[in-house]
C-alpha cells in the first residue's frame, strides 16, 4: 500500500488585508482513518487554526465538505484576513486513537498579508529657525506589508535628496513601519513653502499617499529696521517713523526709546502682508521740536517672536528755522518729561 502523503501545493499565498485566503491541502490516501488539523507554525508553540472534530473557528471554513465519503481535499478558507494572520500554515494528518497520533505534515504554506500603509504623518521642528539654517522634518507611516516601500520627499514640487529612511523591524514581521527624516535648508522665501512626504506601496495601486507640513511653522524671518523723520505741516512738529520690513511670524513688540528711556511700547496690529508671506509694519512718533533741545536720539527697538531685541537709532534733526519758531515759553527745560505724541500705521 502506498504511503500517505499530505500535499500543500502552494509554498506561499499572498492576500490583501480584509480579503479571504484559501489554503489548499489534499491527502493521497483515505487510510489510515483519522482527522486533519491545520496549524500555524510548528513545534510546541504552534497554534491550532482548524480542527473539524471540535472547537470554534468562526473565520475558518472548509472548501469541501470534509464529512463526505472519500473526501481527500482538506483545503480551508480564512475570511477577513488581517496582518496578524501571516505565518506558515501546516496541514497535519492524524491517526485515529486516544489521543489521536500525528502522522504526517504538509510542507507548509506561507501566508503573507498585503496591508496598506497608514497616511504619512509629517512633523517639523519644535523650534523655529532662521533662513540659511537647516531644519529636520520627520515622516512616519505604519502597518504595511510586504516590507518593500518607497518614500520620497518634495519641497514645493521639487524632489529632495538629503533624507534618511528606516523600515522596522529588520526581519520578517506581520507588518512594518517606516520613518524618514529630511533636512531642509530654509530661505527667506519659504513662508509659503510646503514639504511633502510621499509613500508608494504595492497595495496603493500606483496612487501614493502623501503627508504635508508647512514651512511657515518652522521658519522665522527676522525683520529689517529703518528709522527716518519727515517734517509735518505744523512747523514745530516732525514725524519719526520706524519701518519694520519682511518679518515672519506676526508676533512683534516695538518700543520707542528717547535718549535710552522707554517712551512707549506697541504690539504690531495692522500689518501689511507681502507676496512672499512676510509682513511689514510701521510705527511713528509725532515729535514736538520745541520740546526738545539738540542731541535727542530716538531708538526703535523691536522684539520679534520672543527673540533678543534689535534696534535702530535716529538723531532728531531740528533745523534753525524750526528753532526760530519756538518761543522761550514753549521750549521748556532740557529734561522736561515731555512725552512725544505717538501713533502707528
Amino acid at each position: 500500500e502506498e504511503e500517505l502523503q499530505v500535499i500543500q501545493p502552494e509554498k506561499s499565498v499572498s492576500v490583501t488585508a480584509g480579503e479571504s485566503a484559501t489554503l489548499n491541502c489534499t491527502v493521497t490516501s483515505l487510510i489510515p482513518v483519522g482527522p486533519i488539523q491545520w496549524f500555524r507554525g510548528a513545534g510546541p508553540g504552534r497554534e491550532l487554526i482548524y480542527n473539524l472534530k471540535e472547537g470554534h473557528f468562526p473565520r475558518v471554513t472548509t472548501v469541501l465538505d470534509p464529512t463526505k465519503r472519500n473526501n481527500m481535499d482538506f483545503s480551508i478558507h480564512i475570511s477577513n484576513i488581517t496582518p496578524a494572520d501571516a505565518g506558515t500554515y501546516y496541514c497535519v494528518k492524524f491517526r485515529k486513537g486516544s489521543p489521536d497520533v500525528e502522522l504526517k505534515s504538509g510542507a507548509g504554506t506561507e501566508l503573507s498579508v498585503r496591508a496598506k500603509p497608514s497616511a504619512p504623518v509629517v512633523s517639523g521642528p519644535t523650534a523655529r529657525a532662521t533662513p540659511e539654517h537647516t531644519v529636520s522634518f520627520t515622516c512616519e507611516s505604519h502597518g504595511f506589508s510586504p516590507r518593500d516601500i518607497t518614500l520620497k520627499w518634495f519641497k514645493n514640487g521639487n524632489e529632495l535628496s538629503d533624507f534618511q529612511t528606516n523600515v522596522d523591524p529588520a526581519g520578517k514581521s506581520v507588518s512594518y513601519s517606516i520613518r524618514s527624516t529630511a533636512r531642509v535648508v530654509l530661505t527667506r522665501r519659504d513662508v509659503h513653502s510646503q514639504v511633502i512626504c510621499e509613500v508608494a506601496h504595492v497595495t496603493l495601486q500606483g496612487d501614493p499617499l502623501r503627508g504635508t507640513a508647512n514651512l511657515s511653522e518652522a521658519i522665522r524671518v527676522p525683520p529689517t529696521l529703518e528709522v527716518f523723520q519727515r517734517p509735518m505741516r505744523a512747523e514745530n512738529q516732525v514725524n519719526v517713523t520706524c519701518q519694520v520690513r519682511k518679518f515672519y511670524p506676526q508676533r512683534l513688540l516695538l518700543t520707542w526709546l528717547e535718549n535710552g528711556n522707554v517712551s512707549q511700547t506697541e504690539t504690531a496690529s495692522t500689518l501689511t502682508e507681502n507676496k512672499d508671506g512676510t509682513y511689514n509694519w510701521r510705527s511713528w512718533l509725532l515729535v514736538n521740536t520745541c520740546a526738545h533741545r539738540d542731541g535727542v536720539v530716538l531708538t526703535c527697538q523691536v522684539e520679534h517672536d520672543g527673540q533678543p531685541a534689535v534696534s535702530k537709532s535716529h538723531a532728531l534733526e531740528v533745523s534753525a528755522h524750526q528753532k526760530e519758531q519756538c518761543s522761550d515759553t514753549t521750549s521748556g527745560p532740557v529734561l522736561a518729561p515731555t512725552a512725544p505724541l505717538g501713533g502707528s500705521g
Epitope: P44, E102, G108, G171
Partner: antibody, heavy 122, light 112 residues
Framework: QVQLQESGPGLVKPSETLSLTCTVS????????WSWIRQPPGKGLEWIGF???????FYQSSLKSRVTISLDTSKNQFSLKMTSVTAADTAVYYC????????????????WGQGTTVTVSS | DIVMTQSPLSLPVTPGEPASISCRSS???????????LDWYLQRPGQSPQLLIY???SRASGVPDRFSGSGSGTDFTLKISRVEAEDVGVFYC?????????FGQGTKVEIK
C-alpha cells in the same frame, strides 16, 4: 547571516533580578523559537526556556517561578528576567535560535550567541 | 523530563583515526511522523556550542561530511570518520521532541 548578541550586567547580587537581552541581527524573529541556555562553570548545558515568535513561552519547570522570557519584535530583541538569584545561578548565559519546520518537535538550535558570564555575588 | 545519557564522558583520539560517541534517551525520540528529534552539538574550548547534526542524521549547514549521525528510538551514535585537530572539545547530544529540551552530560574529546 543571523547573529545573536547577549547584553546585560556581569555581576548580580544575591536575591536581586538578573536581566539579559539578546539582539537578533541579519535575520527575522518570525518562524523561530528564541531560547536561553546556561552553562555553570565546568558543567554542561541547561535549557532555561524559549519563546516562539507568536509569544508563547516554555520554561524549565524548576525555574518557571523565577523566569520570564519576552520578545520585542520591533527591536528584534528577546529578553530573560530571572528573579531571586543565588550563587547557583552563576553561569555563562547563551541566547540561541531554535528551528521548527513542521510537527510538534524542533529541528536543532542552529544559531548561538557568544555567551555572557553572569556572576551572582555580594 | 527526557534524560539523555552519553558515553564515554572522555574520549582520547588520534588525528586521522575514527571516533564514535553514544547517546541514549530515557524515551523514544522517534515521533509518529517518522522524524527523530535528536541533535548533536560541538563546543570547542572557549566557544559557544555549534549544531552538527539535527533530526538524528541530517548534517547542519557548513558541517564537514566526516561527521555523521545515526540511530533510532532511544540509541544514537555520532561518528567522526577521521578526527582532525579542530575537532577537540565537548560533544553534546540533545533531544528536541518535547520541553524541557535536555542535553547529555557531554563527551570531552582530546588528542592523545
Amino acid at each position: 547571516q543571523v547573529q545573536l548578541q547577549e547584553s546585560g550586567p556581569g555581576l548580580v547580587k544575591p536575591s536581586e533580578t538578573l536581566s539579559l537581552t539578546c539582539t537578533v541581527s541579519g535575520g527575522s524573529i518570525r518562524d523561530y523559537y528564541w531560547s536561553w541556555i546556561r552553562q555553570p562553570p565546568g558543567k554542561g548545558l541547561e535549557w532555561i526556556g524559549f519563546i516562539y515568535y507568536n509569544g508563547r513561552t516554555f520554561y524549565q519547570s524548576s525555574l518557571k517561578s523565577r523566569v520570564t522570557i519576552s520578545l520585542d519584535t520591533s527591536k528584534n530583541q528577546f529578553s530573560l528576567k530571572m528573579t531571586s538569584v543565588t550563587a547557583a545561578d552563576t553561569a555563562v548565559y547563551y541566547c540561541a535560535r531554535v528551528r521548527a519546520y513542521s510537527g510538534i518537535g524542533l529541528d536543532g538550535t542552529d544559531v548561538w550567541g557568544q555567551g555572557t558570564t553572569v556572576t551572582v555575588s555580594s | 523530563d527526557i534524560v539523555m545519557t552519553q558515553s564515554p564522558l572522555s574520549l582520547p583520539v588520534t588525528p586521522g583515526e575514527p571516533a564514535s560517541i553514544s547517546c541514549r534517551s530515557s524515551q523514544s525520540l522517534l515521533y509518529s511522523t517518522g522524524y527523530t528529534y535528536l541533535d548533536w552539538y560541538l563546543q570547542r574550548p572557549g566557544q559557544s556550542p555549534q549544531l552538527l547534526i539535527y533530526g538524528g542524521s541530517s548534517r547542519a549547514s557548513g558541517v564537514p561530511d566526516r561527521f555523521s549521525g545515526s540511530g533510532s528510538g532511544t540509541d544514537f551514535t555520532l561518528k567522526i570518520s577521521r578526527v582532525e585537530a579542530e575537532d577537540v572539545g565537548v560533544f553534546y547530544c540533545g533531544q528536541a521532541l518535547q520541553t524541557p529540551l535536555t542535553f547529555g552530560q557531554g563527551t570531552k574529546v582530546e588528542i592523545k
